[in-house]
Interface confidence: low
């Protein structure tokens, strides 16, 4: 399926808008620190050299690859060696190493002051005066924080943010309608982006054959009734969907998900019951109805899973015939049982049962050998159960604050090493899982809660790969994908950390503390909470709970006095000593 | 597991060569950067040389710049360090690390540079 012009044909099959958005999105999160101007006049160039190729497929230069097109305008940005530093070297090197350049320095982290939200009025002002200018710095904002996202989904954020604005700032209280609306999709944005960030690391980090596992089982759980056939070719077609938008190849990421979309539409009766009410939706909400899409129900009449996978004596044959295959085939099987799982379970115990053959195979007896497989899974299975149950009864009794502030302790304890801040990111993130998992059904609760966690906890490895200050973390983060989360859960107090001096400056307040909103002061508590158990790792519970509750006392008291400033400066050293003492 | 085994150190003379070797296991060797580490008796540990996952960009010490090659082999999973002109101040322990960490985690190989 060659074409002339690369960049033509994208134009042509996504339409100048979508066209326009993407670029926008893949130059943001090319070149974080650009400002929006720069980026759009950029994204006005290739739009309107586009357009000539359209025209005339044959004219100059419309032959060339779209890395080439967008490396060459990227590499135009005079301010590239002082803004960027070491990426301009980027620029002297030749497609396809520019462009694995360039995504080598993507910044998971970049130092981009935090949005902040103006006035509803002062929104909608902007938003009437120039819609156009206002989603596009709405791409422009998400993309450059966020440079993995999911870019077709991207697009249909912003026009459900655009949605908002053409709602709520005709509405007589703009605020009550606008302001709730903002917050879902910031929340859901930061999801989305997590979940992506994810995939991205999978294919990069563990290649495409660990993404496929992935996908088989994901698959099958929300496709049970559809053929092995048919899963595999709907995981060959997502694997290169995501290859394409990790890869930064955004324009043929999006055109080919709607390829998917309507592929999965077309075939709606050999897939899934559950397709039908995505399917009548317009392109961008239909690939997310598609993606979010609930699983089926399950056929009734499935035959148990031992009569092909162990007490066939054909198990090492077939096995050693195309093992790939037959491994594909035991996931999609077990997936399409167990929705109750979480898709990393799954992979596990796949895993262990190739170990098993492995071992089996080459075995005297191989049947003898492989005939208690399944028994081998129960541990597998009873362990993110058993952890789910803990976890959650916690949540119940302590409510998400307290819960996150166990699990900062915990982690704490666990890999010290880390800054703070991503202690507290990572760990008032974990801590959220309690909220969006423990209140569903039993049957729900693992997929809901392990499938999330390797979310965060991939955030972790992802910001600690950037500045590896931990064996302990690089170990868990890259022996092994799906066991990333049981190698976390199994760290205990590391003993051979040396205890960070105390430094009465990072307990230091003042009167600004006041003025936080809960969010603010709840991240300020939490800071100080891993800075005590850094000082003190082997502080008991108890001691952690007295200093503090010591803590919400005193800066309760000085937010209520009349000189809070003052009281601050006079109370901070007191709790500061009496923490000191209660610690020792 | 994840495993880094170095190996290649010994005695030499001042001005002369070693190529160090570090074979990997347990992990994705060709996603990760990699870094050579030293540590001098009774010193911390110093970062000597860090190659991308790729082996395209290369970073060096001020202190052994121009005299020390990192280079990597993904196919045989192994990372390798060519020291030349080597200097009685090169002694330590040398590792290698994922990542462009400071830490060290395996068990090294001398090399000793001494007349």
């Known amino acids: 399926d060659t074409h002339k012009s690369e960049v033509a044909h994208r134009f042509k099959d996504l339409g100048e808008e979508h066209f326009k958005g993407l670029v926008l999105v893949a130059f943001s999160q090319y070149l974080q620190q650009c400002p929006f101007e720069e980026h759009v006049k950029l994204v006005n160039e290739v739009t309107e050299f586009a357009k000539t190729c359209v025209a005339d497929e044959s004219a100059e230069n419309c032959d060339k690859s779209l890395h080439t097109l967008f490396g060459d305008k990227l590499c135009t940005v005079a301010t590239l060696r002082e803004t960027y530093g070491e990426m301009a070297d980027c620029c002297a090197k030749q497609e396809p190493e520019r462009n694995e350049c360039f995504l080598q320095h993507k910044d998971d982290n970049p130092n981009l002051p935090p949005l902040v939200r103006p006035e509803v009025d002062v929104m909608c002002t902007a938003f009437h005066d120039n819609e156009a200018t206002f989603l596009k710095k709405y791409l422009y904002e998400v993309a450059r924080r966020h440079p993995y996202f999911y870019a077709p989904e991207l697009l249909f954020f912003a026009a459900r943010y655009k949605a908002a604005f053409a709602e709520c700032c005709q509405a007589a209280d703009k605020a009550a309608c606008l302001l709730p609306k903002l917050d879902e999709l910031r929340d859901e944005g930061k999801a989305s982006s997590a979940k992506q960030r994810l995939k991205c690391a999978s294919l990069q980090k563990f290649g495409d054959r660990a993404f496929k596992a992935w996908a088989v089982a994901r698959l099958s759980q929300k496709f049970p009734k559809a053929e092995f056939a048919e899963v595999s070719k709907l995981v060959t077609d997502l694997t290169k969907v995501h290859t394409e938008c990790c890869h930064g190849d955004l324009l043929e990421c999006a055109d080919d998900r709607a390829d998917l979309a309507k592929y999965m539409c077309e075939n709606q009766d050999s897939i899934s019951s559950k397709l039908k009410e995505c399917c009548d939706k317009p392109l961008l909400e239909k690939s997310h109805c598609l993606a979010e899409v609930e699983n089926d129900e399950m056929p009734a009449d499935l035959p148990s899973l031992a009569a092909d996978y162990v007490e066939s004596k054909d198990v090492c044959k077939n096995y050693a015939e195309a093992k790939d295959v037959f491994l594909g085939m035991f996931l999609y099987e077990y997936a399409r049982r167990h929705p109750d799982y979480s898709v990393m379970l799954l992979l596990r115990l796949a895993k262990a049962y190739e170990a098993t053959l492995e071992k089996c195979c080459a075995a005297a007896d191989p049947h003898e050998c492989y005939a208690k497989v399944f028994d081998e899974f129960q541990p597998l299975v009873e362990e993110p159960q058993n952890l789910v149950k803990q976890n959650c009864e916690l949540f119940e009794q302590l409510g998400e604050y307290k819960f996150q502030n166990a699990l900062l302790v915990r982690y704490t304890k666990k890999v010290p090493q880390v800054s703070t801040p991503t202690l507290v990111e990572v760990s008032r993130n974990l801590g959220k899982v309690g909220a969006k998992c423990c209140k569903l059904p039993e049957a729900k609760r693992m997929p809901c809660a392990e499938d999330y966690l390797s979310v965060v906890l991939n955030r972790l490895c992802v910001l600690h790969e950037k500045t590896p200050v931990s064996e302990k973390v690089t170990k868990c983060c890259t022996e092994s994908l799906v066991n990333r989360r049981p190698c976390f859960s199994a760290l205990e107090l590391d003993e051979a950390y040396v205890p960070k001096a105390f430094n009465a400056e990072t307990f230091t307040f003042h009167a600004d503390m006041c003025t936080l909103s809960e969010k603010e002061k709840q991240v300020k508590k939490q800071t100080a909470l891993v800075e005590l158990v850094k000082h003190k790792p082997k502080a008991t519970k108890e001691q952690l709970k007295g200093v503090m509750d010591n803590f919400a006392a005193f800066v309760e008291k000085c937010c209520k006095a009349d000189d809070k400033e003052a009281c601050f400066a006079e109370e901070g050293p007191k709790f500061v000593a009496a923490s000191q003492a209660a610690l020792a | 597991e994840v495993q880094l085994v170095e190996s290649g150190g010994g005695l030499v003379q001042p001005g002369g060569s070693l190529r160090l070797s570090c074979a990997a296991s347990g992990f994705t060797f060709g996603s990760f950067g990699m870094s050579w580490v030293r540590q001098a008796p009774g010193k911390g540990p110093e970062w000597v040389s860090a190659?991308?996952?790729?082996?395209?960009?290369?970073r060096y010490a001020e202190s052994v710049k121009g005299r020390f090659t990192i280079s990597r082999d993904n196919a045989k999973k192994t990372l390798y360090l060519q020291m030349n002109s080597l200097k009685p101040e090169d002694t330590a322990v040398y590792y290698c690390t994922i990542g462009r960490s400071a830490s060290r985690g395996s068990q090294g190989t001398q090399v000793t540079v001494s007349s």
């Open positions: 190659i991308d996952s790729g082996g395209a960009d290369t």
